[in-house]
């Protein structure tokens, strides 16, 4: 995701609402924020190929698969 979400997330949660029905092929980059002292909510911000940043539902099945793959990959390397 672009810098805007990351900078904002330094201070507070960034996702007031999430966008449904985004095709994975439209996404150029994903940023997943775990909970922290400034926000007790898991948030996923997607940068789209058209330059927009949107928030996605962390519970979306395709996202959970992507995140699980990343986590599994990380565990194998450790």
């Amino acid at each position: 995701a672009g810098p805007a979400a990351a900078v904002l997330r330094e201070l507070r949660c960034v996702c007031l609402q999430t966008t449904q029905g985004v095709h994975p092929k439209m996404i150029s980059n994903l940023q997943v924020f775990a909970i922290g002292p400034q926000c007790s909510k898991v948030e996923v911000v997607a940068s789209l190929k058209n330059g927009k940043e949107i928030c996605l539902d962390p519970e979306a099945p395709f996202l959970k698969k992507v995140i699980q793959k990343i986590l599994d990959g990380g565990n194998k390397e450790n």
């Epitope: 201070l11 507070r12 926000c39 007790s40």
Partner: antibody
Framework: EVQLQQSGPELEKPGASVKISCKAS????????MNWVRQSNGKSLEWIGN????????SYNQKFQDKATLTVDKSSSTAYMQLKNLTSEDSAVYFC???????????WGQGTLVTVSA | QAVVTQESALTTSPGETVTLTCRSS?????????ANWVQEKPDHLFTGLIG???NRAPGVPARFSGSLIGDKAALTITGAQTEDEAIYFC????????FGGGTKLTVLQ
């Protein structure tokens, strides 16, 4: 409506362990972290730690690192805190608290009184 | 560990503006301390009011506002009401959340 329902009061002997629960409803359980806080002598609050159910990650206040163990059961949307090797100093009311978009401690359970006495 | 200090008690009257403060033993409170304010009413009824210094929680009346005043975090109640009588705790983030001792606010009729 967000609700956090905690288990009932506990009376334990020194050296024992106790596990208290916090059943969440009215929201997507795995997306929000669950904090645990204790109130001793009816006044001061201490943050024990929190559990991130999405990534299954715990963060502890160092003071409670060897005292408390935080877990969750995602299937029942329930958070648990186990306290071990209890002493009289652990006698307190223990709370679970969930955040909102704006604040870490938005919604609180009703509290669970733990009394440690020989 | 850092110590967070609050006024032990304050008294105000309905309609008045009152400010509660939260001081850090480590120096000036900043936005990186993510000041939270929590209200406690009798029977262990806790409600989160403010997070991230100045973000009001859902359903909290607009008369409650959070800010930094000088080197402290502050909770201001503009036009206090009798139902605002409660204990108010602030919490500051260091490497964990540290709560102050609480301010007992009395709203005298």
């Amino acid at each position: 409506e967000v609700q956090l329902q905690q288990s009932g009061p506990e009376l334990e002997k020194p050296g024992a362990s106790v596990k208290i629960s916090c059943k969440a409803s009215g929201y997507s359980f795995t997306v929000y972290g669950m904090n645990w806080v204790r109130q001793s002598n009816g006044k001061s609050l201490e943050w024990i730690g929190n559990f991130d159910p999405y990534f299954s990650v715990t963060s502890y206040n160092q003071k409670f690192q060897d005292k408390a163990t935080l877990t969750v059961d995602k299937s029942s949307s329930t958070a648990y805190m186990q306290l071990k090797n209890l002493t009289s100093e652990d006698s307190a009311v223990y709370f679970c608290a969930r955040g909102s978009w704006e604040t870490i401690f938005a919604y609180w359970g009703q509290g669970t009184l733990v009394t440690v006495s020989a | 560990q850092a110590v967070v200090t609050q006024e032990s008690a304050l008294t105000t009257s309905p309609g008045e503006t009152v400010t509660l403060t939260c001081r850090s033993s480590t120096g000036a409170v900043t936005t990186s301390n993510y000041a939270n304010w929590v209200q406690e009413k009798p029977d262990h009824l806790f409600t989160g009011l403010i997070g991230g210094t100045n973000n009001r929680a859902p359903g909290v009346p607009a008369r409650f506002s959070g800010s930094l005043i000088g080197d402290k975090a502050a909770l201001t109640i503009t036009g206090a009401q009798t139902e605002d009588e409660a204990i108010y705790f602030c919490a500051l983030w260091y490497s964990n959340h540290v709560f102050g001792g609480g301010t007992k606010l009395t709203v005298l009729q």
